[in-house]
Amino acid sequence: MAQWNQLQQLDTRYLEQLHQLYSDSFPMELRQFLAPWIESQDWAYAASKESHATLVFHNLLGEIDQQYSRFLQESNVLYQHNLRRIKQFLQSRYLEKPMEIARIVARCLWEESRLLQTAATAAQQGGQANHPTAAVVTEKQQMLEQHLQDVRKRVQDLEQKMKVVENLQDDFDFNYKTLKSQGDMQDLNGNNQSVTRQKMQQLEQMLTALDQMRRSIVSELAGLLSAMEYVQKTLTDEELADWKRRQQIACIGGPPNICLDRLENWITSLAESQLQTRQQIKKLEELQQKVSYKGDPIVQHRPMLEERIVELFRNLMKSAFVVERQPCMPMHPDRPLVIKTGVQFTTKVRLLVKFPELNYQLKIKVCIDKDSGDVAALRGSRKFNILGTNTKVMNMEESNNGSLSAEFKHLTLREQRCGNGGRANCDASLIVTEELHLITFETEVYHQGLKIDLETHSLPVVVISNICQMPNAWASILWYNMLTNNPKNVNFFTKPPIGTWDQVAEVLSWQFSSTTKRGLSIEQLTTLAEKLLGPGVNYSGCQITWAKFCKENMAGKGFSFWVWLDNIIDLVKKYILALWNEGYIMGFISKERERAILSTKPPGTFLLRFSESSKEGGVTFTWVEKDISGKTQIQSVEPYTKQQLNNMSFAEIIMGYKIMDATNILVSPLVYLYPDIPKEEAFGKYCRPESQEHPEADPGSAAPYLKTKFICVTPTTCSNTIDLPMSPRTLDSLMQFGNNGEGAEPSAGGQFESLTFDMELTSECATSPM
């Protein structure tokens, strides 16, 4: 089946990801109209070879023409219009640069296949994988619905049969007693023996029917329990396990998890059927007590049936007790499962058996590391106490969907102090951000004479005592939930498993897509793979150790890959979110690739990327310019860090950025955002209009204030080939170039440091080349 057809059958959450792949640069209609042809071309090759790209591009235009004529024959006016518009757009945008469209299509196809792979893996592994596909799930769920309906029907049928048995048994009982009393009378007066014989035969027939019915009911009950067991296994081992896996994935930024309501309906329906069946089995006992005989099937089988139904119900209740919302600090909603001591966190448990009679009946108690008391001490882990309201009664009123749940909003952790500063043992094998702890929830259910102990626990949490531990703690949460669906392996980091690049790539992309509107492209991921794994062609399947991901410093750097990336994520979220969402920040791009794509561009073309040498996270721009001899130069400005972006928005820095040439003229080297978006078009809307900067004038002064504008300036010589960044100088020493190379990023061309000026503007200085 064609890739495009397969994609159409995926679940909504995948389709949403698919929609994100397509934009105006490669419209989805085109992908749809020419699906088979598009899939038959070698776009990756075209993306790397101009001559082939030109050929494929012209063929693409030809295919559009053919499709257009088909629509013409079908009189499909709308599609004709769309195709004509698409063709005009493609010609205007890519005729001169066919490699670019090839690159875009190649990326889309690659992302599509990755999407299908994710979905397929999920389907095969049934819950071990990230998120099952819709086609598979729907079919599976329809089957489940069918089985549940079948169970309900069988329970109702049995109800009817029990009534029939009861009626017959009452008749038998009455006739038997009547005959017995008549028999006693006949003993006295020796009356009609043939009538008695007839009545005896009738009783025998009744008893035969009764026995047959009882056998039938016992056998049907056994079959029903097997059917229930099957449905229960499907619900708990597949559906609930899938939901739990999806919850893990959602916790680390993956697609949001589905709602529990449907699962709750299924589990409640099954639990109701089980209780009804349990009543029927009790009824058998009553029937047996009224009438019993040699070989009575009830005597033989009822105890085993009773045992089985109780066990099924008990297990269903235990499985139905889940952590609906994993522990999370409200101030860090996108980083659940990391808890800082002394800071409030929230969590929510839910019982997926929605019995109104249980409302306000279940008192939940929370504790931490319940089963690992001694083990923790041996391992040298820290020990904690839970403070705050650590008991709560489950109710149906607090949640807006009427689910039976308990939300804990005011919990905090406090470390138990030991003699040696909190660690129970000096030679602790794990660092604190690799220590995993479990929060346990317990309650007791008393229902229809049964006492059931319920217990569930959170996914492993990492407890930190300082917010600076957050990056490493979050890395632990990512690694754990990426690589295991074991819900309670607190010893995970004693021998952390190895991840593959495909797994890591997906999770890294989620770190962006979960808090911004855009994940990482194939090219961005390839750059990251290169940083982690060194130069290579195909990173798929390459192994990445926990140490490489987050503990060891990167080659030639004083910090790890994760620390660097996490700071970039923070930078994006706090300072350049809008620009990232627009797709204006290329971000992760190797120096070679940067040079390759910029060198063919006109002077003034620039791109935005993240600093590779700044531990704290920095963003820079690189542009093309010609030197006096007409030679193309690639220049980069020294990266802007959070500190600088605190004072001035990145968009305003870009809009106002100047270089001062040898004649002290300020010129803007940034004209087009790669590939060819005019700077004003891209960033203008993110800069405050000058009229709004100082809306008020001092009423006491005769003239209004002079307006000021901050701009960033890089001083340079005519040759524009400074190899080292300059230290900031005062305006007086602007032309004295410093030689402070600290923190410099080696760059293909010059690397510039910018100075920020506060320039006063009056109507007289309009000649200044701003």
């Epitope: 017959l168 009744m206 039938s216």
Partner: nanobody, 127 residues
Framework: HVQLVESGGGSVQAGGSLRLSCAAS????????IGWFRQVPGKEREGVSV????????YYADSVKGRFTISQDNTKNTLYLQMNSLKPEDTAMYYC????????????????????WGQGTQVTVSS
């Protein structure tokens, strides 16, 4: 609740034929047994023929074997009894009955296994 209405009875000469029908409403065609019984005044009700709701099992009393045929139309929820080569001893009130239980050999004609009964239709065969 199941309601059963028989029809098709009447008077016929020996050797003649009749087709009885039994229309069932509210009938749950689950694992069940449907049958024809007959009763002559002053005698026990006896089984004539039974069929399982799926039609896999058909059983006849020795006295009617080879002459009577039981069938059903599940789309119409109707049971039939085709009676050929009728004899005077076939004269009786014919009842249609259903059981919520499966058809079991030892209780095929045990009337206590059947929990829903029709009002009956009279068949008279004269010599």
């Amino acid at each position: 609740h199941v309601q059963l209405v028989e029809s098709g009875g009447g008077s016929v000469q020996a050797g003649g034929s009749l087709r009885l029908s039994c229309a069932a409403s509210g009938f749950n065609s689950g694992d069940s047994c449907i049958g024809w019984f007959r009763q002559v005044p002053g005698k026990e009700r006896e089984g004539v023929s039974v069929i399982s709701s799926g039609g896999e099992i058909r059983y006849y009393a020795d006295s009617v074997k080879g002459r009577f045929t039981i069938s059903q139309d599940n789309t119409k929820n109707t049971l039939y009894l085709q009676m050929n080569s009728l004899k005077p001893e076939d004269t009786a009130m014919y009842y249609c009955a259903t059981s919520v239980f499966l058809c079991y050999p030892r209780t095929w004609f045990n009337r206590y296994m059947y929990n829903s009964w029709g009002q009956g239709t009279q068949v008279t065969v004269s010599s």
